[in-house]
């Protein structure tokens, strides 16, 4: 038992927020300022991420967890852990190499990020157009032409199994 204990890595006892200091006979030392260790048994502490420039601090660094960044207003996060910030555009626009450009006719973007997408082609789905699309919003398709023919019933369909939840009225 004694032998097993002596063979055990003493660094494994060092908790998160500390590191196993080789310069001090493998004593567990607290992470220095602006560094952290998120797991036990670490031989070094990692340098805290600094949220500078277009990044802003969402969560401060602590001895056991890294700082988390997001983007300043007018920008949005891209990549894992918000590794990049990309400029926002207005709804109805998309970001190009030359900056924000309005969506071309027949396309829309209902967000401040991403690309313009084509309006739904209602007729491809056997539907008519209820409301035309805009740069900021897709078309709303309406009833199928068959529903509009003389003699078609206007009975409300049966209740859906699960009620949808979309834009509030």
């Amino acid at each position: 038992f004694e032998r097993t204990r002596s063979l055990q890595d003493p660094c494994s006892n060092c908790p998160a927020g500390t590191f196993c200091d080789n310069n001090r006979n493998q004593i567990c030392s607290p992470c220095p300022p602006n560094s952290f260790s998120s797991a036990g048994g670490q031989r070094t502490c990692d340098i805290c991420r600094q949220c500078k420039g277009v990044f802003r601090t969402r969560k401060e660094c602590s001895s056991t967890s890294n700082a988390e960044c997001d983007c300043t207003p007018g920008f949005h996060c891209l990549g894992a852990g918000c590794s990049m910030c990309e400029q926002d555009c207005k709804q109805g626009q998309e970001l190009t190499k030359k900056g924000c450009k309005d969506c071309c006719f027949g396309t829309f973007n209902d967000q401040k990020r991403g690309i313009c997408r084509p309006w739904t082609n209602c007729s491809l789905d056997g539907k008519s157009v209820l409301v035309n699309g805009t740069k900021e919003r897709d078309v709303v398709c309406g009833p199928s032409p068959a529903d509009l023919s003389p003699g078609a019933s206007s009975v409300t369909p049966p209740a859906p199994a699960r009620e949808p939840g979309h834009s509030p009225q």
Partner: nanobody, 125 residues
Framework: QVQLVESGGGVVQPGRSLRLSCAAS????????MGWYRQAPGKQRELVAS????????NYADSVKGRFTISRDNSKNTMYLQMNSLKPEDTAVYYC??????????????????WGQGTQVTVSS
């Protein structure tokens, strides 16, 4: 489920006005757009006017532009059609219609169209 009930139809002389109402009840939170359709005897049902419930954006059939106005009161879950300068050719059954979901299809492949039972509008001298 969404229920739609129209009211305000009737007989009116040419040149006069009428206001139709469509009261929605049930899962009105899911409605993204509403419209008024009309159907004259033996004819196809046609779109008269439509409105996005969120931003109030409207569309009109050419035949009613400048005469009809569609509007909504979201607090009352009611849509209106103000019909001015009525003509005999406006005579039809007017139906309220509601749509849940943009594009043509709904989340998880479902789609929902809701109709009212209709209200008769007769323009005659």
């Amino acid at each position: 489920q969404v229920q739609l009930v129209e009211s305000g139809g009737g007989v009116v002389q040419p040149g006069r006005s009428l206001r139709l109402s469509c009261a929605a009840s049930g899962s009105t939170f899911s409605i993204v757009a509403m419209g008024w359709y009309r159907q004259a005897p033996g004819k196809q049902r046609e779109l008269v006017a439509s409105i996005i419930t969120g931003d109030g954006d409207t569309n009109y059939a050419d035949s009613v532009k400048g005469r009809f106005t569609i509007s909504r009161d979201n607090s009352k879950n009611t849509m209106y059609l103000q019909m001015n300068s009525l003509k005999p050719e406006d005579t039809a059954v007017y139906y309220c219609y509601a749509r849940t979901g943009y594009g043509s299809s709904w989340l998880m492949g479902h789609e929902y169209d809701y109709w009212g039972q209709g209200t008769q509008v007769t323009v005659s001298s």
